[in-house]
């Protein structure tokens, strides 16, 4: 496939990536699937600069990112290494809280109203951000 050189309509370009900001809410798994169907992934935050960019666009609203620990270890959806990567948890987070009474702990990460991260119940219908890299080969077949 050919390399994508510009962002799709309604996506925002920033530092060689394209971002799409939802205005409705979905459970984390549904948001993850939505991004995949767009040949993208839930946003992976790799720097303070990217954190500020996303934070500016989402405002003070709980918003899913591509980070979860549903299988135990914290994992970014694109394979970026959690251990060595950027982190911006709220103080006292993540806490895998069980007190919500919905079953299980808290396995999915989201931006909170101040931009810092919290782990929460993955079924909560939060907004989400999709990201795709501009230099990633698109899935469209080459023209013959």
């Amino acid at each position: 496939g050919s390399e994508r050189t510009c962002c799709p309509v309604n996506w925002v370009e920033h530092e060689r990536s394209c971002y799409w900001f939802s205005r409705s809410g979905k459970a984390w798994a549904d948001a993850d699937n939505y991004c995949r169907l767009e040949d993208a992934h839930l946003v992976v935050v790799t720097s303070w600069e990217e954190q500020k960019f996303v934070q500016h666009h989402i405002g003070p609203v709980n918003t899913w990112m591509g980070l979860h620990d549903q299988n135990g270890p914290w994992k970014w959806v694109d394979g970026t290494d959690y251990e060595t990567g950027f982190k911006n948890w709220r103080p006292e987070q993540p806490d895998d809280w069980y007190g919500h009474g919905l079953g299980g702990g808290e396995d999915c990460a989201h931006f909170t109203d101040d931009g810092r991260w919290n782990d929460d119940v993955c079924q909560r219908p939060y907004r989400w951000v999709c990201e795709t890299e501009l230099d990633k080969a698109s899935q469209e077949p080459p023209l013959l």
Partner: antibody
């Protein structure tokens, strides 16, 4: 490589105390809940206690509540279990584990006997 | 507290056999179930979480299924290294509880 290494086990008399430690390495310790699980000789696994990554939430099995105290030092990447008023039935191998049990230490044997 | 009942408590099987172990919860635990393998003198090893998600590095001969109260662990073709004791554990709510274990022995 993720590693958990328990220490502090040994022989103690009924009513005595012991402090177990679990040294963690290879991961961001403060991002993970940690657990203590024990196994009496020839028996199955029994969950003992859990603590959230930043010390905000702690849970205990009824069998140890009021006698055992779980704690952690994120600066030292260490998990602890303070065991007081020990009973014969506390004799077991004690394991520390991470999150949903994705990794475990090798265990440390605690024997309560007079 | 949620009780976890595993069956059978032990079974004898031959190399190459398909083995199924069941775990029943006393109440709905969604898919918050893990399976562990333990060999004598060793620490437990995580095989499956979230009822059916295979842990990294675990061979695909292991599979898990179920939701709600009834769960199964299947070993598609038993190998010599698979003879061990298997435990289920619910993490839907505290206190966390384990099944009593299933010992898989050589026939």
């Amino acid at each position: 490589e993720v590693q958990l290494v328990e220490s502090g086990g040994g022989l103690v008399q009924p009513g005595g105390s012991l402090r177990l430690s679990c040294a963690a390495s290879g991961f961001t310790f403060s991002s993970y809940s940690m657990n203590w699980v024990r196994q009496a000789p020839g028996k199955g696994l029994e969950w003992v206690s859990s603590i959230s990554g930043r010390n905000t939430t702690i849970y205990y099995a009824d069998s140890v509540k009021g006698r055992f105290t779980i704690s952690r030092d994120n600066a030292k990447n260490s998990l602890y279990l303070q065991m007081n008023s020990l009973r014969d039935e506390d004799t077991a191998v004690y394991y520390c584990s991470r999150d949903r049990g994705s990794c475990w230490g090798q265990g440390t044997l605690v024997t309560v006997s007079s | 507290d949620i009780q976890m009942t595993q069956s059978p408590s032990s079974l004898s099987a031959s190399v190459g056999d398909r083995v199924t172990i069941t775990c029943r919860a006393s109440q709905d635990i969604n898919n918050y179930l893990a399976w562990f393998q333990q060999k004598p003198g060793k620490a437990p090893k995580s095989l499956i979480v979230a009822a059916s998600s295979l842990q990294s590095g675990v061979p695909s001969k292991f599979s898990g299924s179920g939701s709600g109260t009834d769960f199964t662990l299947t070993i598609s073709s038993l190998q010599p290294e698979d003879f061990a004791t298997y435990y289920c554990q619910q993490y839907n709510s505290y206190p966390l509880t384990f099944g009593g274990g299933t010992k898989v022995e050589i026939k």
